[in-house]
Interface confidence: low
């Protein structure tokens, strides 16, 4: 009988970390230094991402996966895929066009990034201020005066502050 010829693309046999080299009769060649292919059957390897300047390498490039960058100390990532590094500020500050500025009275920032947020308004929940707010910390709300009868619980812990900025959906 006549053997049927395989119609499969010979390049499909090239695993991740290699590329199908058209210059060498479609032989699977290893990716050159500083390049990678994360899937099989590729005709080229991609250049590794370089973590330069304010970026530092979080994960080295390998023949099968790209490098991942984060930011040097004093900076933090912004944007999808850490597309830039933004300067850190101190707690109690926020970054403005003119650099780090202290939070205005009535606002706080308990992190090195993000914006100053208003203190919690305890009275909206019918509670009183147990601990005053600062530039670095939110107020702590306590029970309302009416709740301070004998046997009543003394302190209601504050809800944890949400981190500002975008979080993945």
């Amino acid at each position: 009988f006549e053997r049927t010829r395989s119609l499969q693309d010979p390049c499909s046999n090239c695993p991740a970390g290699t590329f199908c080299d058209n210059n060498r009769n479609q032989i699977c060649s290893p990716c050159p230094p500083n390049s990678f292919s994360s899937a099989g059957g590729q005709r080229t390897c991609d250049i590794c991402r370089q973590c330069k300047g304010v970026f530092r390498t979080r994960k080295e490039c390998s023949s099968t996966s790209n490098a991942e960058c984060d930011c040097t100390p004093g900076f933090h990532c912004l944007g999808a895929g850490c597309s830039m590094c933004e300067q850190d500020c101190k707690q109690g500050q926020e970054l403005t066009k003119k650099g780090c500025k202290d939070c205005c009275f009535g606002t706080f920032n308990d992190q090195k990034r993000g914006i100053c947020r208003p203190w919690t308004n305890c009275s909206l929940d019918g509670k009183s201020v147990l601990v005053n707010g600062t530039k670095e910390r939110d107020v702590v709300c306590g029970p309302s005066p009416a709740d301070l009868s004998p046997g009543a619980s003394s302190v209601t812990p504050p809800a944890p502050a949400r981190e500002p900025g975008h979080s993945p959906q």
Epitope: S37, A39, Q42, D46, K52, V54, A80, H166, P168, Q169
Partner: antibody, heavy 125, light 108 residues
Framework: EVQLVESGGGLVQPGGSLRLSCVAS????????MNWVRQAPGKGLEWVSY????????YYAGSVKGRFTISRDNAKKSLYLHMNSLRAEDTAVYYC??????????????????WGQGTTVTVSS | DIQMTQSPSSLSASVGDRVTITCRAS??????LNWYQQKPGKAPKLLIY???SLQSGVPSRFSGSGSGTDFTLTISSLQPEDFATYYC??????????FGQGTRLEIK
């Protein structure tokens, strides 16, 4: 040739669903972050959704959050947008776009460097 | 979110003219600014990235400048194929990616 080809658009009633697909060729799809961008008739460009190259990080525009779902299948070199609870204001041409990275000495920049031809979604009763 | 505002919304010009389109960001975006060209019925095409770097294959009559909040796209000598809509886009703080509203360049 580096190429993105969208499909799956069509006419759908308000409240209905569609799934858009985008097939990549000519580049290592699994190495790139991808986005969906739409354009309502006679209007400008509006970003819809982002997915990282591994699919672990996802973002949505506020106007579609909770109704649209982005996903990808790197083995099939495909990007998807599942659209539920469609509204008249979702009527647009939907483009998939590759997020290319350009390295600078301090920062690195990204831009939408490859776009598909677009697929039209019409939401009407 | 960072807002991008382009001006003018539309303009008429003749072949050979020098044309400038401006884009303003609602806050400083350093040089994280891209420009796209879109012709009717077609997908957008990247022209300039990082405010002033020309994308491969784009004619040298296109140039970009600016940093911070104010940016310009300049076409030094308009050609017939340049009549299109142009969009700026910031990539400084994402998500969301935000675009300007577009500038339509028409033949006078």
């Amino acid at each position: 040739e580096v190429q993105l080809v969208e499909s799956g658009g069509g006419l759908v009633q308000p409240g209905g669903s569609l799934r858009l697909s985008c097939v990549a060729s000519g580049f290592t799809f699994s190495s790139y972050e991808m986005n969906w961008v739409r354009q309502a008739p006679g209007k400008g460009l509006e970003w819809v959704s982002y997915i990282s190259n591994s699919g672990t990080t996802i973002y949505y525009a506020g106007s579609v959050k909770g109704r649209f779902t982005i996903s990808r299948d790197n083995a099939k070199k495909s990007l998807y947008l599942h659209m539920n609870s469609l509204r008249a204001e979702d009527t647009a041409v939907y483009y998939c776009a590759r997020e290319g990275t350009i390295f600078g000495t301090v920062h690195y920049y990204f831009a939408l460097d490859v776009w598909g031809q677009g697929t039209t979604v019409t939401v009407s009763s | 979110d960072i807002q991008m505002t382009q001006s003018p919304s539309s303009l008429s010009a003749s072949v050979g003219d020098r044309v400038t389109i401006t884009c303003r960001a609602s806050q400083s975006i350093s040089s994280y600014l891209n420009w796209y060209q879109q012709k009717p019925g077609k997908a957008p095409k990247l022209l300039i990235y990082a405010a002033s770097s020309l994308q491969s294959g784009v004619p040298s009559r296109f140039s970009g400048s600016g940093s911070g909040t104010d940016f310009t796209l300049t076409i030094s000598s308009l050609q017939p194929e340049d009549f299109a809509t142009y969009y700026c886009q910031q990539s400084y703080s994402t998500p969301p990616i935000t675009f300007g509203q577009g500038t339509r360049l028409e033949i006078k």
